[in-house]
């Protein structure tokens, strides 16, 4: 059920680190924050769920990476890319980006100063 871990490359690289962590709790945490009482998201019912569940696991996963601005930015970009197709309109995309940039702070990490979240060929 688990990945056969990883892309090729140096084990200390950000890409390798991002590939090793489970970003799904981060994705669900943000979706819950922007969707609130809206319809069921994915196969997990976020309507009646405490966001702290996802947030704790999300922060734990981000904490597994070297706390560098570049690695944090790559993780945020990966989350954005993973969820891009689920964001229904421009407003939702902007909300998601805003929450995403707040994520490091919520986990008590340094937020990347410059992090371009325009992914998926400009669609998001």
């Amino acid at each position: 059920m688990r990945r056969e871990r990883g892309r090729q490359g140096d084990s200390s690289s950000c890409e390798r680190q991002v590939d090793r962590v489970n970003l799904k709790p981060c994705e669900q945490h943000i979706m819950q924050r922007i969707m609130g009482e809206q319809e069921q998201y994915d196969s997990y019912d976020i309507r009646s769920t405490r966001s702290s569940d996802q947030q704790q696991r999300c922060c734990d996963e981000l904490n597994e990476m070297e706390n560098t601005q570049r690695c944090m930015c790559e993780a945020l970009q990966q989350i954005m890319e993973n969820q891009c197709d689920r964001l229904q309109d421009r407003q939702m995309v902007q909300q998601f980006k805003r929450e995403l940039m707040n994520l490091p702070q919520q986990c008590n990490f340094r937020a990347p100063q410059r992090c371009d979240l325009d992914v998926s060929g400009g669609r998001c």
Partner: antibody, heavy 123, light 108 residues
């Protein structure tokens, strides 16, 4: 073959110490969070502690906080539980368990368990 | 701490019957973090379901899981002799990662 083997259990007096170990084989140990779960005689399962892949995040059950210390050595594929100030209530079979997650959807679960090592705290 | 309460404590049924096991949380738990385990006497626990409703590898399709929020259910559609065991639910989203006290499924 994916395997976890616990060791270090035994009989110890209240207030004493014991160090449990768990040897992992058949998988890339450093890719997985690890847990200790215990089961008192005739009772249910009780989660004891967890440690993430890099040891950066560690959690304990309230019942063992301040007395037990979890650690891991990724180079040696081993997990440890240092148990101090042991009490009668710590008498149990201690299981080491690997935690994995579903890559496509995200849920976590303990999919590989050792057979357990028995700790008896008695005077 | 999230307290998980399983009911009934003991369930007496015959092979071929349907079993419904309940797990109730003291506060809301994401489906993503709800797991079921099976344990037989003298053995280590075995992973059964995760994400509330996804069967683990090699678990037969007579086992199914459902629920959300505070109420979760494990259903065994037609009991086989090897299904008689103790079943535990666990939440692993928020530390401490608590287990329910277990439901013993015994042969009637």
């Amino acid at each position: 073959e994916v395997q976890l083997v616990e060791s270090g259990g035994g009989l110890v007096k209240p207030g004493g110490s014991l160090r449990l170990s768990c040897a992992a084989s058949g998988f890339i140990f450093s890719d997985y969070n690890m847990n200790w779960v215990r089961q008192a005689p005739g009772k249910g399962l009780e989660w004891v502690s967890s440690i993430t892949r890099s040891s950066r995040t560690i959690y304990y059950a309230d019942s063992v906080k301040g007395r037990f210390t979890i650690s891991r050595d990724n180079a040696k594929n081993s997990l440890h539980l240092q148990m101090n100030s042991l009490r009668d209530a710590d008498t149990a079979v201690y299981y080491c368990a690997r935690e994995d997650f579903d890559v496509s959807t995200g849920p976590y679960y303990m999919d590989v368990w050792g057979n357990g090592t028995t700790v008896i705290v008695s005077s | 701490e999230i307290v998980l309460t399983q009911s009934p404590g003991t369930l007496s049924l015959s092979p071929g019957e349907r079993a419904t096991l309940s797990c109730r949380a003291s506060q809301s738990v994401s489906n993503m973090f709800l797991v079921w385990y099976q344990q037989k006497p003298g053995q280590a626990p075995r992973l059964l379901m995760y994400g509330a409703s996804t069967r683990a590898t090699d678990i037969p399709d007579r086992f199914s899981g459902s629920g959300s929020g505070t109420d979760f259910t494990l259903t065994i559609s037609r009991l086989e002799p090897e299904d008689f065991a103790v079943y535990y639910c666990q939440q692993n989203g928020n530390s401490p990662y608590t287990f329910g006290q277990g439901t013993k499924l015994e042969i009637k």
